[in-house]
Interface confidence: medium
């Protein structure tokens, strides 16, 4: 028997520095977790103790903090090189700055293979990107070889900016021939490493013949055997065992997100490359693990230039940006409109001639808007200003919901109206009318939504049975502020870009902004 240790991360999302327990900015260092310096300590400890170790990343290193805003992926290449990753799969967020923003800082600089079998380049890009990412890689580990085959969510064109010269094929269809090829090369230990979410990971384990282990990402899935060490609730045991169609037991793993855990999986193979046993657990990277001093020093160097960024002008406002709780928790506020407009603008993807865009709607809990911005400071808007408005380090995500769920969400928005509670929704691409004289649960008297399958966008009544795409904060997607119906009834959830980054990019693009209160949210006569 031959034993392999797989160390894995996924959805790190620019958390190079240690973070608080909820993966936001570290405040009290003695309680902080994760970060590449701490990760390196643990990885080195395992490398010294065990003979056959692979360090893998399942995508979405890009996007999530000011590190990515400033360094645009160069920080990913640099620190992943320093940690000596063995391979990485491309995630959807690796395309956030277009193909060039992937090629230059990461693909050309990485000293490890970057993989995806289901992304095919065409046209002029094919020669430019040739060899910079691979469908698979055979890695020598000790006296053996291990094949790593990559995959990426086929939804990436809807979630990011890969352009028109990359085709995202069905994962299973694309993976099978690559695995077959590895088999003909006498590689009998094969790991599928990819970024399509836990449901697809399980399908790959079930359907792709020859895959021994699946290491996934995208869905931020936390798996654990035994008592979990922090706040995350396990979606299943680690590893999650799938019985394949040809009768093999295939372990599937994921390691939550944000570098909070290091996935740790030990696999035992027989001489024919069959998995005999698999066990392990994610390792919580808490403050009991010291930060490696040389990596920490490196982090501190890169930080020097970050601190200055926060105070630089992104653009100007010529109107007061009303982010006060007195407004945003009670009525339409122009800060809410600005943020929602930025959220939609960030998700413009012309992927189908029938649709002017794939999504037109935004909802945003008023309680998530934490500060106004005064235009009398020469109109200047800085990252620091936006961090006061959106201090929680969340993301603006894409979900699919039925009209009936949206209707419930808007009823919840005003179910206890008047108490300055955070669930009052700010909107974009939606016109809602409330009648507060009616009883809670029956106060939405009109709910019109902006069409997407149209050349001239217009507002149509919400259809209860139709499925709609909506951009919203991850806080709402996870059921925050009492929006349990969203969490329970959503049909799909893809995590998006860092909230401040979305708004800052929009302001930089617009240069001068003047959002108005324009009748997106109305109250029927006599009730308000």
């Amino acid at each position: 028997a031959w034993e392999l240790t797989i160390l894995h991360t996924n959805d790190v999302h620019s958390r190079l520095e240690q973070t608080s327990e909820d993966s936001s900015k570290c405040v009290n260092a003695s309680r902080c977790m994760g970060g590449v310096a701490r990760l390196f300590t643990k990885v080195q400890q395992i490398r010294r103790a065990e003979p056959n170790v692979l360090l893998l990343d399942a995508g979405d290193q890009y996007q999530g903090t000011i590190w990515f805003t400033v360094y645009k992926g160069a920080e990913v290449a640099h620190f992943m090189n320093a940690l000596r990753y063995d391979a990485m799969a491309l995630g959807n967020h690796e395309f956030d700055n277009g193909v060039e923003g992937l090629i230059e800082p990461l693909l050309k600089e990485a000293k490890f293979p970057i993989l995806s079998a289901n992304i095919k380049a065409k046209g002029p890009l094919a020669s430019q990107i040739s060899g910079l990412y691979l469908p698979y890689k055979v890695l020598p580990v000790g006296d053996e070889v291990v094949g790593i085959v990559g995959y990426t969510s086929k939804e990436t064109p809807f979630l990011s900016n890969p352009g028109t010269n990359l085709v995202f094929e069905d994962e299973i269809t694309a993976l099978q021939p690559e695995v077959d090829k590895l088999k003909t090369l006498n590689v009998n230990k094969i790991i599928a490493l990819g970024h399509s979410g836990f449901e697809m990971d399980k399908l790959i384990a079930q359907k792709v013949r020859g895959v021994d282990v699946v290491v996934g990402g995208h869905s931020n899935t936390f798996l654990y055997t035994g008592n979990p060490p922090s706040k995350e609730v396990p979606a299943g045991k680690y590893p999650f065992i799938v019985t394949s169609d040809d009768g093999r037991k295939v372990p599937v793993v994921q390691a939550y997100a944000f570098g909070k855990y290091l996935g740790y999986l030990k696999i035992e193979f027989d001489e024919r490359g069959n998995v005999i046993s698999s066990h392990g657990n994610p390792i919580l990277l808490n403050s009991s693990i010291p930060e490696d001093p040389s990596i920490k020093a490196d982090i501190n160097k890169w930080r020097i230039k970050l601190d200055n960024y926060s105070t630089q002008e992104l653009g100007k406002t010529i109107v007061y940006l009303d982010g006060s709780s007195q407004s945003c928790r009670f009525r339409e506020c122009n800060m809410g409109n600005l943020i929602c407009d930025a959220m939609i603008n960030n998700n413009l993807r012309h992927t189908d001639e029938m649709f002017w865009n794939h999504v037109s709607m935004c909802i945003l809990n008023g309680g998530g808007i934490r500060s106004p911005i005064d235009e009398r400071n020469n109109g200047t808007i800085t990252w620091e200003n936006l961090a006061a408005v959106l201090p929680f380090g969340g993301t603006f995500d894409l979900v699919q919901l039925k009209g009936s769920t949206l209707k419930k969400a808007f009823e919840h928005s005003v179910h206890r109206y008047g108490q300055s509670t955070g669930e009052f929704l700010q909107v974009g691409g939606i016109h809602v009318v409330y009648d507060l004289s009616r009883k809670p649960g029956d106060r939405v008297v009109k709910l019109d939504v902006l069409c997407t399958k149209c050349r001239v966008p217009s507002y149509d009544p919400l259809k209860m049975d139709e499925v709609y795409k909506v951009i919203l904060p991850n806080f709402l997607a996870n059921g925050g502020d009492g929006f349990q119906m969203i969490k329970d009834e959503l049909l799909r959830h893809d995590s998006g870009d860092q909230d401040i980054n979305v708004v800052s990019t929009y302001i930089s693009k617009m240069k001068v902004i003047y959002p108005a209160v324009e009748g997106r949210i109305k109250f029927s006569t006599g009730s308000h």
Partner: antibody, heavy 120, light 111 residues
Framework: QVQLVQSGAEVEKPGASVKVSCKAS????????ITWVRQAPGQGLEWMGD????????NYNEKFKTRVTITADKSTSTAYMELSSLRSEDTAVYYC???????????????WGQGTLVTV | EIVLTQSPATLSLSPGERATLSCRAS??????????MHWYQQKPGQAPRLLIY???NLESGIPPRFSGSGYGTDFTLTINNIESEDAAYYFC?????????FGQGTKVEIK
Amino acid sequence: QVQLVQSGAEVEKPGASVKVSCKASGYTFTSYWITWVRQAPGQGLEWMGDIYPGSGNTNYNEKFKTRVTITADKSTSTAYMELSSLRSEDTAVYYCAKEGGLTTEDYALDYWGQGTLVTV
Amino acid sequence: EIVLTQSPATLSLSPGERATLSCRASKDVSTSGYSYMHWYQQKPGQAPRLLIYLASNLESGIPPRFSGSGYGTDFTLTINNIESEDAAYYFCQHSRELPFTFGQGTKVEIK
């Protein structure tokens, strides 16, 4: 090999602006900071500011903040430094320099342009 | 901002002698075992050239007679067995915090 090639000497009148270019080659332009340093005749070196071409992020010395603008064009791998409201004391050689990779030189300036003399 | 003071202003040596150049920072420029101090050489009519980075690391292509030392606020550039081609100005620079600043320079003359 790494090279930084600057534009030629300039003579400007007081109150005017000057824009100096710095074309980079031999490395990934977007992944390293470009710094601008000036040296008045017979004087020492003065750090003016820098730019990260990958994102366009800039830092400026407070002394020049209102007058200097540093930009970068990724498509041509060229950085620019524009200094406005020129006065006689701005007469100097203006250098662009590449900051080293953070694994090694750590913000030290490992490659320099040949310098551009600006006479006001 | 951090002010760097170099001494002496001028140093006149014969070939084969040792040059010791000093750079003092107005504030600690070291942290986590690293010192963010660098040394450059500049000859008349030329751009500066990096000699030493992070206080003591020799830049590639620089002769080993050049060395650097120091931690905190006091740093030294040493040139052993000085040669005529070493006649130049020498500048220290820190990169501990923004703005990065240079010392005023030391002129090294060879008799």
